[in-house]
Amino acid sequence: MAVTACQGLGFVVSLIGIAGIIAATCMDQWSTQDLYNNPVTAVFNYQGLWRSCVRESSGFTECRGYFTLLGLPAMLQAVRALMIVGIVLGAIGLLVSIFALKCIRIGSMEDSAKANMTLTSGIMFIVSGLCAIAGVSVFANMLVTNFWMSTANMYTGMGGMVQTVQTRYTFGAALFVGWVAGGLTLIGGVMMCIACRGLAPEETNYKAVSYHASGHSVAYKPGGFKASTGFGSNTKNKKIYDGGARTEDEVQSYPSKHDYV
């Protein structure tokens, strides 16, 4: 029960996280104009990963793509790549985890397969979350560098002719969404990995128990049991669908009632 809850909660947390990563990637407010020294301004600038926007005092907002003629900054390309990789891994992780959920029954999928899928999706969520956190952090670092550089050159003389104020940019809402979403995806991934440990069948050891029946021995190998009986070995942890019990000298007998449990 606890395993199912942990797995389910991990899935939901990751789902929210990935939705947040997608939202952050699409948002236009990765950086916003710092209004500290200029609270009343005719235009308010903000930028996302894909376009830049200007909101005028009249309320009119104009957004447009970045100037690509001389190429885009490598940092921006890196952030875009990290966020996209995060989304792709997260989406694949979600798909895998749906099939791995204990509450969902798909054919005769074994617990070991579900455990493997849960672990796979968990790792994917962890990497996805790390990608998002890294992407947002790289952009934040770019902003901090730009902010202090702008502060140092706050009053920039244009060719010694005019005194002008250089626009400074600070953290936009998308950065916080990205950090929180990345963290949630990471937590969800860790929960999935924890749930995987509970799902994985333990190393069970069974011994073929011999029942002596009139004249020849019949060995029953109830490999389908999950609880350990403490006897011999069934190292492969596989259910034995061998059509019935076999005699010690390989003479087929009646089917075992344990074969399909």
């Epitope: 970045y66 001389l70 900054p73 770019m142 902003l143 050159n153």
Partner: antibody, heavy 124, light 107 residues
């Protein structure tokens, strides 16, 4: 204060080469590209090319490929333009210019800081 | 290359006048247009970028407009320090090209 200080006037013979310099101050040199612009006496402006000091990437106007070579020295915050195989057509004022783009990611390309210009005279 | 045409090479106006300088591109430049002012001493200054965005420190009497291939710079109240040559420049494709300039004089 952002400034671009250009080297003094050059007098050269036809066929010779000249190397003009443009020293940047008042901003982080590697943050913005430096363009070079030509202006012949009484005529308009012509963009020669741009260099990105951070990466060393150069972009040229096809018309000036083979004529101009742009370089930058990060340690001295100086951009250079070498003009070779000079002819009378190369006699002009050469400006270096940069755009201190105020957005984190560039949405525009403009030149808001200009050097004072270097006059190159090609005469035999 | 995209050709930028400033049909009026020189213009005379009186102080306080409203002056409009036009510029035409040989193809659609999607508003990627800047305006520069070159004073008689050779100093160059950016006035307007992206068709209508006023560069910081530039007086509000300067304004830009246009779209597609036709653009204009307007000086609403001409002042003595506005005596200069004005150039338009596109940056929609490489290479960016400048107009031939419009010289503004006082009547």
């Amino acid at each position: 204060q952002v400034q671009l200080q250009q080297s003094g006037a050059e007098l050269a013979r036809p066929g010779a080469s000249v190397k003009l310099s443009c020293k940047a101050s008042g901003y982080t040199f590697t943050s913005y590209g430096i363009s070079w612009v030509k202006q012949r006496t009484g005529q308009g402006l012509e963009w020669i090319g741009e260099i990105s000091p951070r990466s060393g990437n150069t972009y040229y106007n096809e018309k000036f490929k083979g004529k101009a070579t742009l370089t930058a020295d990060k340690s001295s915050s100086t951009a250079y333009m070498e003009l070779r195989s000079l002819t009378s057509e190369d006699s002009a004022v050469y400006f270096c210019a940069t755009g201190v783009i105020t957005t984190v990611i560039p949405t525009d390309w403009y030149f808001d800081v200009w050097g004072t210009g270097t006059t190159v005279t090609v005469s035999s | 290359d995209i050709q930028m045409t400033q049909t009026t090479s020189s213009l005379s106006a009186s102080l306080g006048d409203r002056v409009t300088i036009s510029c035409r591109a040989s193809q659609d430049i999607s508003n990627y247009l800047n305006w520069y002012q070159q004073k008689p001493d050779g100093t160059v200054k950016l006035l307007i970028y992206y068709t209508s965005r006023l560069h910081s420190g530039v007086p509000s009497r300067f304004s830009g407009s246009g779209s597609g291939t036709d653009y204009s710079l307007t000086i609403s109240n001409l002042e003595p320090e506005d005596i200069a040559t004005y150039y338009c420049q596109h940056y929609s494709k490489l290479p960016p090209t400048f107009g031939s300039g419009t010289k503004l004089e006082i009547k």
